[in-house]
């Protein structure tokens, strides 16, 4: 069998809302993946599991099941959304994200995704992780790749 390639493209959109009473930020983050099947037979994308971390804390998880099949030598682009919550011991972020005298409220999030594919009863898992900028101060739609955070290390928050 040839490889199945998973490429994390980036954040497609981030939609933000706030709970004033709880000083909580809700971010719905939609990500884009390209999955390429380099084989001469179809493969099933059985599930995608994703999680988002902020400052080493998991702030959101998602799982998509029975997603699609990819034909021989074909590629499919898949969007998936992770609902995230920034609250409690990170409620200081609410002050940053709702401070409107600054225009851009970029925070660095670590996106982790695992794709499980199956073919002929065989299962394969491919994982990727990437740091991405997301604006927590407003709803944002990104050009693919625009939100990428290029440094290897996550900055101090």
């Amino acid at each position: 069998p040839r490889s199945i390639d998973v490429k994390y493209i980036g954040v497609k959109s981030a939609y933000v809302s706030y709970d004033v009473q709880k000083r909580t930020i809700y971010l719905n983050i939609t990500n884009t993946l390209n999955i390429t099947n380099n084989n001469y037979y179809s493969v099933e994308v059985e599930n995608i599991t994703a999680q988002v971390q902020f400052a080493k804390t998991v702030i959101g998880k998602a799982r998509l099941n029975n997603i699609t099949h990819i034909g021989p030598l074909d590629m499919k682009q898949i969007d998936y959304t992770v609902p995230t919550v920034i609250a409690e011991e990170m409620s200081y972020m609410y002050d940053f994200c709702t401070l409107i005298s600054i225009k851009v409220h970029n925070i660095v999030l670590m996106m982790q995704v695992t794709v499980t594919t199956t073919y002929f009863g065989h299962s394969e898992q491919i994982s990727q992780e990437r740091y991405q900028y997301v604006d927590c101060g407003r709803n944002t739609t990104y050009q693919l790749g625009q939100s990428e955070y290029l440094n290897v290390l996550q900055p101090q928050q």
Epitope: V20, Y92, F96, T98
Partner: antibody, heavy 119, light 112 residues
């Protein structure tokens, strides 16, 4: 717990430069979204914002006084400084510093320091 | 600048009854993010101001739930459900929507 304390000369002569210090504890000015602001209150009157400084060193001044004000910080010493140039009797007031934040406004205030401009 | 307007004095109120204090802004304080950037402070006699309410409706830490706030984008009301002697002072509304941040002139709570 969060505390702030203002200090100043008490009395200053007209046309001099006034220096005020705000010493704080219980929070870090390295935290995103945090800042310290200066507010003054002439005796028997209302509150007036003077200046603010944020964690990222952004500074904002009340426009009518901007040419006379300078705000700065020493994060390692947990201190904020405000200088007011060319003071006159209209600057006589109680000066407060307060911890500010985007979401919560001025959540913590110092006890204030009273300034009298007199020759 | 956004002008915050308040009456200088409240209607005289009896201890244990409710009181309302009004504030009007010259421009809507409702931001496109859904948050209204209106704040209430109380300055008790001889003391520093203290934060009561942030972003129109969020009670500050340690503030009793006798205090509540609401309003539209430009007209706001602070309500005290059962006035106590310790509530006496000057109530200031303020806005953080636009620079410069501004305070209202303050409303003095009067007891009967």
């Amino acid at each position: 717990q969060v505390t702030l304390k203002e200090s100043g000369p008490g009395i200053v002569q007209p046309s001099q430069t006034l220096s005020l210090t705000c010493s704080f504890s219980g929070f870090s000015l390295n935290t995103l979204g945090r800042g310290v602001g200066w507010i003054r209150q002439p005796s028997g009157k209302g509150l007036e914002w003077l200046a603010k400084i944020w964690w990222n060193d952004d500074k904002f001044y009340y426009p009518a006084l901007k040419s006379r004000l300078t705000i700065s910080k020493d994060t390692s010493k947990n201190q904020i400084f405000l200088k007011i140039a060319n003071v006159d009797t209209a600057d006589s007031a109680t000066y407060y510093c307060a911890r500010i934040a985007g979401g919560t406004g001025a959540a913590y205030w110092g006890q204030g320091t009273t300034l009298t401009v007199s020759s | 600048d956004i002008v915050m307007t308040q009456a200088a004095f409240s209607n005289p109120v009896t201890l244990g009854t409710s009181a309302s204090i009004s504030c009007r802004s010259s421009k809507s304080l409702l931001h496109s993010n859904g948050i209204t950037y209106l704040y209430w402070y109380l300055q008790k006699p001889g003391q520093s101001p203290q934060l009561l309410i942030s972003q129109m409706s969020s009670l500050a830490s340690g503030v009793p739930d006798r205090f509540s706030s609401g309003g539209s984008g430009t007209d706001f009301t602070l309500r005290i459900s059962r006035v106590e002697a310790e509530d006496v002072g000057v109530f200031y509304c303020a806005q953080n929507l636009e620079l410069p941040w501004t305070f209202g002139g303050g409303t003095k709570l009067e007891l009967k």
